[in-house]
């Protein structure tokens, strides 16, 4: 008996120590966002336990006071969804004592009207403005910095239109000391882990991004006043380029944000001469007027792998050898508007194309190909190391596209007992209907039959291998009863069959010498018990009258016994 | 186009009180502060204050604070500057200046003479 | 207060010459400086802001630079318009304080 698995919060995360009772989930945001609702659910013990609270969200609140501003964001409410409408939002951020603060722009976007987001250089509504929305056209690329410890962040939305709102990253950082870079999409490293006069630092973007503007290396100066001597670079994803790397991805020009109209770019993707391509593409949301072409080759007169307008979901595409050219011609007329419109492909160098590309190992598995070239028609069965089991299909194979014909299995720890069966002659009463960890059967004879073995079987995780039941499942056998003693003959009369002891369950059969009719009972039964008993005393043969013996003998034959019942033969 | 229209020259005697005025167009008045700005003859230019018309909230320079007194009219989308107990100290041009990022947009100034 | 510190207080320069201007905050002002314009009849126009954004509509041949606690303001080629006088202002903190200026004359 368990709690569900607590549900994940938009955001944010979850940490569960057991779902059993007594187990604790624990949940945290992500910056920028905060827990609406209990941090902390313990798992309550009951028929069918429970969490003692409801789940959490994460929800970007509308303003607030942040002390002690270390590293962080301040995220507008719904962000990155719409803000909604008539807010007034403040936040103040405070950095440590002795530090100042530095503020990127992860992202503005305001409705046109008169939505509105200022910087104050201070603590209040009334300090000096350093950076008003309505006054910059274009963010700047270097952030903001506080001259004293803090920052006061206004965000105002009138009556209509709404936008994505904003996204801002707050470092806090020492005397003496750039602050910290910061780099969207991509990923920096630095020589020491608190930026002082001589640091440099190095960066690159997340795959699929090119860095544009500023320097890939800068270095902290100036020990009068520390400041980095380039701007942070930035990474966006680019309209065309050339790419010559085993893997990587393709991004719509400026994605995640939506790309601008009437673009034609173009990519070329190389790889070894002996391979081929493989595209992955995992997300395709454009236009009806807009198009995305694949080449099989390395220009615009290569077949045509694929052309593709509007949505579609996840695909693949191989090319029959190792270049591909992938065109994205935007309508000039219109334009999809919105986050995450556009495309994301993912491409791998695979071998050449008479076989499958190579199959990964899967965690706490292993594979056996029923071959060693993954040629047309080749079967991979994965399997999985005891206590785990198959999730998805466990053989794959390689079809005449060379393309897999399942997606690839995982092993899951096996966390439940297999149902241990019915039993003959009983029914079971069951705690828990998958049977997890800690669940029990409990086997109960029907009756005249006796349990052999274990009444009550649970379910016991193992440290190897995966969880079993505390014992076979039971039998359930006939009752093995005591015999009933032979009752003796009536006089003048015989019984059938004449033995010394009856099986509980048996029946003996009376009859009467001529001339003589029986008083009682003609069968009788052994009746199962503790002791087993007859069912009726034996009965008498009474001398009877000619017409009555005429008549008894009538009766006699009336009354014959079943077929399987076997008649003394006096008769 | 934003554009802030100052009252005219002002002359005055000494100990007298003159009240100037800035007339604010082509933006929302009540979604910026507005400043004053001093500027004696063949001198530098010295800030006096502030105020807000949405809240009218008042900030001034402890060098002037009880020289001047701000005031705001939103009907009218009007700032004013109230100066009193005039000495011949305060003959200066005044400007009136939009509180954007660094004093965005001025006024033409107003000239005050203050002299028996 | 913040001190601003510009120098020089008066240049003569001939057209098409670059010159530049400076001024020194006396505490941390963060790049919270703008550089305005006054005209001879009195005009008064902000020129940079941020240190080194161009407010809209002023020629790029202005253009503003930091280093440190000074702050440049570079006009690359003298035009007969630019002659004038020029001062720096910290926004960082109030009260807002101005630097000098300085007065460009033509040679």
């Known amino acids: 008996l368990s709690c569900h698995f607590p549900r994940r919060p938009a955001y944010g995360d979850v940490t569960v120590t057991s779902l059993h009772p007594g187990g604790s989930a624990r949940f945290h945001c992500a910056t920028g966002y905060q827990l609406k609702g209990a941090r902390h659910l313990t798992c309550l013990n009951a028929t069918q336990p429970f969490w003692d609270s409801k789940e959490p969200v994460c929800i970007a609140a509308c303003g607030g006071v942040i002390r002690n501003a270390t590293t962080g964001r301040i995220v507008s409410p719904g962000f990155p969804g719409n803000y909604s409408n008539n807010l007034t939002c403040h936040w103040l951020l405070e950095a440590p004592e002795g530090q100042r603060l530095h503020l990127h722009f992860e992202k503005v976007s305001l409705a046109e009207d008169d939505d509105r987001l200022i910087i104050r250089n201070g603590d209040n509504v009334e300090a000096p403005p350093v950076y008003d929305s309505y006054e910059v056209e274009y963010l700047p690329i270097e952030g903001l910095l506080s001259s004293g410890k803090h920052f006061f962040v206004e965000l105002s939305t009138d009556s209509s239109g709404a936008a994505a709102g904003m996204a801002l990253r707050y470092e806090a950082f020492q005397q003496g000391h750039c602050y910290e870079p910061f780099v969207k999409y991509g990923n920096f490293s630095s020589s020491t882990p608190t930026y002082p006069v001589g640091t440099t630092v190095e960066f690159s973007c997340d795959p699929g991004y090119t860095l544009e503007q500023g320097s890939i290396i800068i270095e902290c100066v100036d020990p009068h006043d520390p400041q980095w001597n380039e701007t942070e670079p930035a990474c966006r994803a680019v309209c065309s380029g050339e790419i010559t790397d085993s893997a990587g991805v393709v991004l719509s020009p400026n994605w995640p944000e939506p790309y601008g109209r009437g673009q034609d770019c173009i990519w070329g993707v190389h790889v070894e001469e002996d391979k081929r391509i493989m595209l992955d593409i995992r997300v395709l949301r454009i236009g009806p007027g807009d198009v995305l072409t694949f080449y099989d080759g390395d220009d615009l007169t290569a077949r045509v792998l694929g052309q593709y307008s509007g949505p579609r979901s996840h695909f693949k595409l191989f090319t029959s050898m190792a270049d591909v050219t992938i065109q994205f011609q935007s309508d000039p007329g219109t334009s999809v508007l919105g986050y995450q419109q556009g495309f994301v492909i993912h491409f791998f160098e695979v071998p050449r194309n008479d076989t499958c590309p190579e199959l990964p190992e899967i965690p706490n598995g292993w594979k056996s190909p029923s071959q060693p070239e993954l040629v047309h028609g080749t079967v991979v069965t994965y399997q999985c190391y005891p206590g785990y089991q198959v999730v998805g299909s466990s053989v794959l194979m390689c079809q005449w596209d060379l393309t897999w014909s399942e997606d690839l299995p995982s092993c899951q720890r096996v966390t439940s007992c297999h149902d241990p069966g019915d039993v003959e002659h009983s029914r079971r009463l069951i705690s828990s209907p998958k049977f997890p960890v800690g669940a029990t059967v409990q086997y109960i004879c029907d009756q005249g039959f006796v349990l052999m073995g274990s009444s009550i079987l649970t379910c016991h995780d193992r440290q190897a291998g995966s969880p079993k039941w505390s014992d076979r499942a039971p039998k359930c056998l006939l009752e093995q009863l005591k015999p009933c003693h032979g009752l003796s003959a009536p006089e003048n009369g015989a019984r059938s069959p004449e033995k010394q002891l009856h099986p509980a369950g048996a029946t003996i059969h009376f009859s009467c010498a001529p001339g003589y009719v029986l008083k009682g009972q003609a069968s009788i039964k052994c009746v199962p018990g503790h002791p087993s008993h007859w069912s009726d005393p034996p009965p008498i043969c009474r001398a009877a009258s000619l017409d009555g013996f005429y008549n008894s003998r009538s009766l006699d034959v009336a009354k014959a016994p079943a077929a399987s019942s076997t008649l003394d033969a006096a008769h | 186009q934003v554009q802030l229209q100052q009252s005219g020259a002002e002359l005055a005697r000494p100990g007298a009180s003159v009240k100037m005025s800035c007339k604010a167009s082509?933006?929302?008045?009540?979604?910026?502060?507005m400043h004053w700005v001093k500027q004696r003859p063949g001198q530098g230019l010295e800030w006096i204050g502030y105020?807000?018309?949405?809240?009218?909230?008042?900030k001034y320079n402890q060098k002037v604070k009880d020289k001047a007194t701000l005031t705001a009219d939103k009907s009218s989308s009007t700032a004013y500057m109230q100066l009193s107990s005039l000495t011949s100290e305060d003959s200066a041009v005044y400007y009136c200046?939009?509180?954007?990022?660094?004093?965005?947009?001025w006024g033409q100034g107003t000239t005050l003479t203050v002299s028996s | 207060d913040i001190q601003m510190t510009q120098s020089p207080s008066s240049l003569s320069a001939s057209l098409g010459e670059r010159v530049s201007l400076t001024c020194r905050a006396s505490?941390?002002?963060?790049?919270?400086l703008s550089w305005l314009q006054q005209t001879p009849d009195g005009t008064i126009k902000r020129l940079i802001y941020?240190?080194?954004t161009l407010h809209s509509g002023v020629p790029k041949r202005f253009s503003g630079s930091r280093s440190g606690s000074d702050y440049s303001l570079t006009i690359s080629s003298l035009e007969s318009e630019d002659f004038a006088g020029y001062y720096c202002?910290?926004?960082?903190?109030?009260?807002?304080?101005f630097g000098g200026g300085t007065k460009l004359e033509i040679k």
């Open positions: 505490q941390e002002i963060s790049g919270y």
């Open positions: 082509g933006y929302t008045f009540t979604s910026y502060t």
């Open positions: 105020i807000n018309p949405r809240s009218d909230y008042t």
């Open positions: 941020a240190a080194s």
């Open positions: 202002l910290q926004y960082a903190s109030y009260p807002y304080t």
């Open positions: 200046a939009r509180g954007g990022l660094g004093l965005d947009y």
